[in-house]
């Protein structure tokens, strides 16, 4: 039975040109995390394999940095980066847990004042 839950940073906003850290945390399970995939819609951004380390998709190499931890840092944000991001935890023996983050990239410093942080 899958007992774990994923906490995420929920809905977040950031300023164009800036950077943001996407974070998920898996709790309430003793399952072994074998790999975490970060995806944007249907595009794979990065993989963190527990044994080998990180793989950043070639098309995102210039704007995506691994970490901190199992999180992902997005840099040089553009308005086109607005959208849903998913952290997909592959675990053994539980299976797959998925967390969702919605990022809104704003044109101005409105982002700083309008940032929303929630753990669903």
């Amino acid at each position: 039975m899958m007992t774990g839950t994923i906490e995420t940073t929920g809905n977040i906003s950031a300023e164009k040109g800036g950077s943001i850290i996407l974070q998920c945390h898996l709790s309430s399970t003793t399952a072994q995390v074998t790999q975490v995939n970060w995806e944007q819609q249907d595009q794979l951004l990065a993989i963190c394999n527990a044994d080998l380390g990180w793989h950043i998709s070639p098309s995102f190499k210039d704007r995506v940095a691994p970490g901190p931890g199992l999180g992902l840092t997005l840099q040089s944000l553009t308005v086109n980066d607005t959208g849903e991001y998913f952290c997909i935890y592959h675990t053994y023996p539980d299976g797959t847990y998925t967390g969702r983050i919605f990022l809104e990239v704003l044109e101005s410093s409105v982002a700083e004042h309008g940032a929303r942080f929630q753990i669903p």
């Epitope: 074998t34 993989i47 950043i56």
Partner: antibody, heavy 117, light 107 residues
Framework: EVQLLESGGGLVQPGGSLRLSCAAS????????VSWVRQAHGKGLEWVVY????????YYADSVKGRFSISRDNSKNTLYLQMNSLRAEDTAVYYC??????????WGQGTLVTVSS | DIQMTQSPSSLSASVGDRVTITCRAS??????LNWYQQKPGKAPKLLIY???SLHTGVPSRFSGSGSGTDFTLTISSLQPEDFATYYC?????????FGQGTKVEIK
């Protein structure tokens, strides 16, 4: 006691194929990722390929991608490496190694693969 | 790929000496750095993982330190069985990559 025992090495002509096996014992094989690492004579270590414990994700070094294929049979506690289109530069001792915490914590004794005409 | 550069490539030392081997990564690898010992004709053995954690059964005279790009393996008092080749390896970015090795010889 953790043990890994490779077999299947030998002499093969360029363009030929070989299948290596690695028999594991002394631990729950299905809980661990495993890699093949090779070492040419008098040279350093080169990671070749990895397979994860449960779901079978695989990662390959660019130098072997499309030519080598890793698989595992958890019911037999055995790891396999199918090597096709072999080249002279694939000549090396091939080790299977268990993954732990980012390192390779236990290694087999190695099996020699020689690609030569 | 991340390049791992070890120095020195070889060194001569005497039993009882303190020996230090360094490993530099071409970019940050946080603390995802492992050290191995290999003797001629034998498989490598893991000594240190995650930069400073001692693997099971490894004598306490071996220690590791560092983070980011610069790492050190120290043998506090060299023993006869320590003459071997030592390799560092990063496990931060796929593919895992090894240093070229440091051969520790008897002076």
């Amino acid at each position: 006691e953790v043990q890994l025992l490779e077999s299947g090495g030998g002499l093969v002509q360029p363009g030929g194929s070989l299948r290596l096996s690695c028999a594991a014992s002394g631990f729950t094989f299905s809980n661990y990722g495993v890699s093949w690492v090779r070492q040419a004579h008098g040279k350093g270590l080169e990671w070749v390929v990895y397979i994860n414990p449960s779901r079978g994700y695989t990662y390959y070094a660019d130098s072997v991608k499309g030519r080598f294929s890793i698989s595992r049979d958890n019911s037999k506690n055995t790891l396999y490496l199918q090597m096709n289109s072999l080249r002279a530069e694939d000549t090396a001792v091939y080790y299977c190694a268990r993954s732990y915490g980012g390192g390779f914590d236990y290694w087999g004794q190695g099996t020699l693969v020689t690609v030569s005409s | 790929d991340i390049q791992m550069t070890q120095s020195p490539s070889s060194l001569s030392a005497s039993v009882g000496d303190r020996v230090t081997i360094t490993c530099r990564a071409s970019q940050t690898i946080e603390r995802r750095l492992n050290w191995y010992q290999q003797k001629p004709g034998k498989a490598p053995k893991l000594l240190i993982y995650d930069a400073s954690s001692l693997h099971t059964g490894v004598p306490s005279r071996f220690s590791g330190s560092g983070s980011g790009t610069d790492f050190t393996l120290t043998i506090s008092s060299l023993q006869p069985e320590d003459f071997a080749t030592y390799y560092c390896q990063q496990s931060y970015i796929i593919p895992p990559t090894f240093g070229q090795g440091t051969k520790v010889e008897i002076k």
